[in-house]
Amino acid sequence: AWELTILHTNDVHSRLEQTSEDSSKCVNASRCMGGVARLFTKVQQIRRAEPNVLLLDAGDQYQGTIWFTVYKGAEVAHFMNALRYDAMALGNHEFDNGVEGLIEPLLKEAKFPILSANIKAKGPLASQISGLYLPYKVLPVGDEVVGIVGYTSKETPFLSNPGTNLVFEDEITALQPEVDKLKTLNVNKIIALGHSGFEMDKLIAQKVRGVDVVVGGHSNTFLYTGNPPSKEVPAGKYPFIVTSDDGRKVPVVQAYAFGKYLGYLKIEFDERGNVISSHGNPILLNSSIPEDPSIKADINKWRIKLDNYSTQELGKTIVYLDGSSQSCRFRECNMGNLICDAMINNNLRHTDEMFWNHVSMCILNGGGIRSPIDERNNGTITWENLAAVLPFGGTFDLVQLKGSTLKKAFEHSVHRYGQSTGEFLQVGGIHVVYDLSRKPGDRVVKLDVLCTKCRVPSYDPLKMDEVYKVILPNFLANGGDGFQMIKDELLRHDSGDQDINVVSTYISKMKVIYPAVEGRIKFSTGSH
């Protein structure tokens, strides 16, 4: 028998520095977790103690903190090289800055293979990107070889910016021929490493003949055997065992997200490459594990540029950005309009000729807007200014909701109007009319939404049974500010980009902004 140790991360999302337990900014160092310096300590400890070790990443290193905003992926390549990762699968967020934003900082700089079998390049891109990412890689491990085959969510064109010259195929259809190829090369130990979510990971384990282990990402799934060490609630045991269609027991693993845990899986193979046993658990990277001093010193060196960035001008406003509670919790405010416009702009994806965009709607709780920005400061907008507007470190996510759920959300928005409460919704791609003379729960008298399946966008009445895509803060997706109906009834939830980053990118792109109050939210009395 031959034993392999698989160390794995996924959905690190730019958490290069240690974080607090909830993966936000570290405020009390003695209680902080994760970060590449601490990860390196643990990885090195295991490499020294065990003979056959692979360090793998299942995608979405990109996006999540100011590190990515400033360094644009160069930080990912640099620190993953320093940690000596053995392979990485492409995640959807690796395409957030377009294909160029993946090729230059990461694909060309990484000293480890970057994988995806179901992404096929076409047109002029095919030759440009050739060899920079691979469908699979055969890695020597001790006296043996292990095949790693990659995959990426086929939803990526809706979640990021891969452009029109990359085709995202069905994962299972694309993986099978690559695994078959590995078999013909006499590679009998095969790991599928990818970024499509736990449900797809399990399907791959079940359907793709020849895959021995699945290491996944995208769904931030926490698996654990025994008593979990922190707040994450396990979705199942680690590893999660799937019985394949050809009768094999295939371990499936994921390691939550944000570099909080290091996945640790021990696999025993027989001489024919069959899995005899698998066991392990994610390792919580808490403060009992010291940060490696040389990596920490490097982090501190790279940090300097971030501190300077906070006060640099991103763009200018020539109007007052009204983010006051007196406005944003009572009526349409232009800060709400700005943020919603940025949220939609961040999700522009021309993936289908029938649709001008896949999503047109944004909702945003007025209580999440915490500061105005005065244009009389030379119009300057900095990251620091935006951090005062959006101080809670959330993300702007993509959800799918029925029209009936949206209607309930808008009724909740004004069910106790006038008390300066945070649930009053700011909007984009939506025209809503409220009649406050009616009883709570029956105050929405008109709700029109911007079409997506159209060449000329126009507003149509909301249909109760139709499924709509909406961009909103993760706080609302999780039921915050009383929006329990969103949490309970959402049909799909994909986590998105850091809130401040979305707005800062938009302002940098527009250079000069002048959002208006333009009749997205209206109040009326009487009949309609």
């Epitope: 909830d22 009390n28 005062a388 706080f475 039921g479």
Partner: antibody, heavy 117, light 105 residues
């Protein structure tokens, strides 16, 4: 590190006044609504007052309305509670706390106010 | 809005499953939090938005409910869980329940 440190507690006679302070550090104080909560010896928690992050809204428990005033100075990262016409039943440990936001809340360790003749 | 917690005290053993309930005098949607307090210490947030587990809180704690009836459940009591528990609504001006003292049997 996030810290809320209350001060200004002590012994005061019935009818007297005290001003409590709460010094905040380690987070964006000006972005959070702030509360005062108290706990009489051996009793449960009682909410006292709240002030919105930018200072435009203040609300009080009925038991302190007209006697207590909450205020804040965002430039000094400090929350205040001016307590007038104090009564024996105001004897308690007074805590300052942030609102529950997307990441939860923060509390101080409390300051003891004793109203006795 | 008044909050009524029950029971006011409870004896249980390590490993037990414990449930504490809280009833609001009128509907509060999911604007409900649960706190744990130990003698001489500030309260510690366990659950907010009725069912969202606060960072750093063990997963044996869970919250449920919406509207007027809410529940805090501890799936398997640990020695450090013996304390007083409070619910608090933040739908209107905040109000705490009277507390539930959880003691070792």
């Amino acid at each position: 590190e996030v810290q809320l440190v209350e001060s200004g507690g002590g012994l005061v006679q019935p009818g007297g006044s005290l001003r409590l302070s709460c010094a905040a550090s380690g987070f964006t104080f000006s972005s959070y609504d702030m509360h005062w909560v108290r706990q009489a010896p051996g009793k449960g928690l009682e909410w006292v007052a709240v002030m919105s992050y930018e200072g435009s809204n203040k609300y009080y428990a009925d038991s302190v309305k007209g006697r207590f005033t909450i205020s804040r100075d965002n430039s000094k990262n400090t929350l205040y509670l001016q307590m007038n016409s104090l009564r024996a039943e105001d004897t308690a440990v007074y805590y300052c706390a942030t609102e529950i936001a997307a990441k939860g809340d923060y509390w101080g360790q409390g300051t003891l106010v004793t109203v006795s003749s | 809005i008044q909050m009524t917690q029950s029971p006011s005290s409870l004896s249980a053993s390590v490993g037990d499953r414990v449930t504490i309930t809280c009833r609001a005098s009128q509907g509060i949607s999911n604007y409900l939090a649960w706190y744990q307090q130990k003698p001489g210490k500030a309260p510690k947030l366990l659950i907010y938005a009725a069912s969202t587990l606060q960072s750093g809180v063990p997963s044996r704690f869970s919250g449920s409910g919406s509207g007027t009836d809410f529940t805090l459940t501890i799936s398997s009591l640990q020695p450090e869980d013996f304390a007083t528990y409070y619910c608090q609504q933040s739908y209107s001006t905040p109000h705490f329940g009277q507390g539930t003292r959880l003691e070792i049997k």
